[in-house]
């Protein structure tokens, strides 16, 4: 079976809840691909070590992405 026919998405549930950027250890944005037909956002939480799936369409999550990219652009020279 060609790999392109093997759907392997990471997220089967998605959270709409706001996430405090300070509580994030890592934020991964996985673009849609031949393996998974949709964008997936995975937040690794500092305290719990939990990898949580976030809803890319949620207003709260879009705001989180803006806040994180703003923070990153501040840090980069």
């Amino acid at each position: 079976v060609p790999l392109s026919r093997t759907v392997r998405c990471t997220c089967i549930s998605i959270s709409n809840q706001p996430v405090n950027p300070r509580s994030l250890e890592k934020l991964e944005i996985i673009p849609a691909s031949q393996f998974c037909p949709r964008v997936e956002i995975i937040a690794t939480m500092k305290k719990k070590g939990e990898k949580r799936c976030l809803n890319p369409e949620s207003k709260a999550i879009k705001n989180l992405l803006k806040a994180v990219s703003k923070e990153r652009s501040k840090r980069s020279p």
Partner: antibody, heavy 120, light 108 residues
């Protein structure tokens, strides 16, 4: 509070079909993946199938692939398990469960279970 | 699909500490979750992720993992902890879920 109420089940002959349903309440159903898990009498838990929050992705245990179909209707806050070509070995209590947000897909809340008996 | 292996039965004296283990290759990639099941009842989530307890689960329950082994520890076991305990994780293939065979805990 989160509630998963199951319907269906009963006694059915080998080769016949049965449809289980699970009505969810107390949470945003359209954000959660859902599992079906079964337990044969006196045995352990066996995962059966999972469906993603939007119904676009479905995975099945090898033991039921091609015979069982998982589906959902987000407008009705319901998930279903269509069981065709039933075998004696499918006799079990079937549980509907919600999948947590984490990438390990752990079931967090469970329905009360419904008994399916396949017997001639 | 990969397997999770548990000891079929474990016993503990009332008030003592007991550890229930779960082994499997998938635990190198995914955290285990732990479920408590009492006779005639649906399973209840006891521990998930790194070491997270849902509300209502007493703090005597804790989880840990190392390599391909996950553990559920009950510190100061109570009579009401007597039950079957199942571990669970996402399969290493990524598109299945697997349960351990279960451990029957007896509190003496």
């Amino acid at each position: 509070q989160v509630q998963l109420v199951q319907f269906g089940g009963g006694v059915v002959q080998p080769g016949r079909s049965l449809r289980l349903s699970c009505a969810a309440s107390g949470f945003t159903f359209s954000s959660y993946g859902m599992h079906w898990v079964r337990q044969a009498p006196g045995k352990g838990l066996e995962w059966v199938a999972v469906i993603s929050y939007d119904g676009s992705i479905k995975y099945y245990a090898d033991s039921v692939k091609g015979r069982f179909t998982i589906s959902r209707e987000n407008a009705k806050n319901s998930v279903y398990l269509q069981m065709d070509s039933l075998r004696v070995g499918d006799t079990a209590v079937y549980y509907c469960t919600r999948a947590g947000y984490s990438t390990d897909w752990h079931p967090d809340y469970w329905g009360q279970g419904t008994m399916v008996t396949v017997s001639s | 699909s990969s397997e999770l292996t548990q000891d079929p039965a474990v016993s503990v004296a009332l008030g003592q500490t007991v550890r229930i283990t779960c082994q499997g290759d998938s635990l190198r990639s995914y955290y285990a979750s732990w479920y408590q099941q009492k006779p005639g009842q649906a399973p209840v989530l006891a521990i998930y992720g790194k070491n997270n307890r849902p509300s209502g689960i007493p703090d005597r329950f804790s989880g840990s993992s190392s390599g391909n082994t996950a553990s559920l520890t009950i510190t100061g076991a109570q009579a009401e902890d007597e039950a079957d305990y199942y571990c669970n994780s996402r399969d290493s293939s990524g598109n299945h879920v697997v349960f351990g065979g279960g451990t029957k805990l007896t509190v003496l």
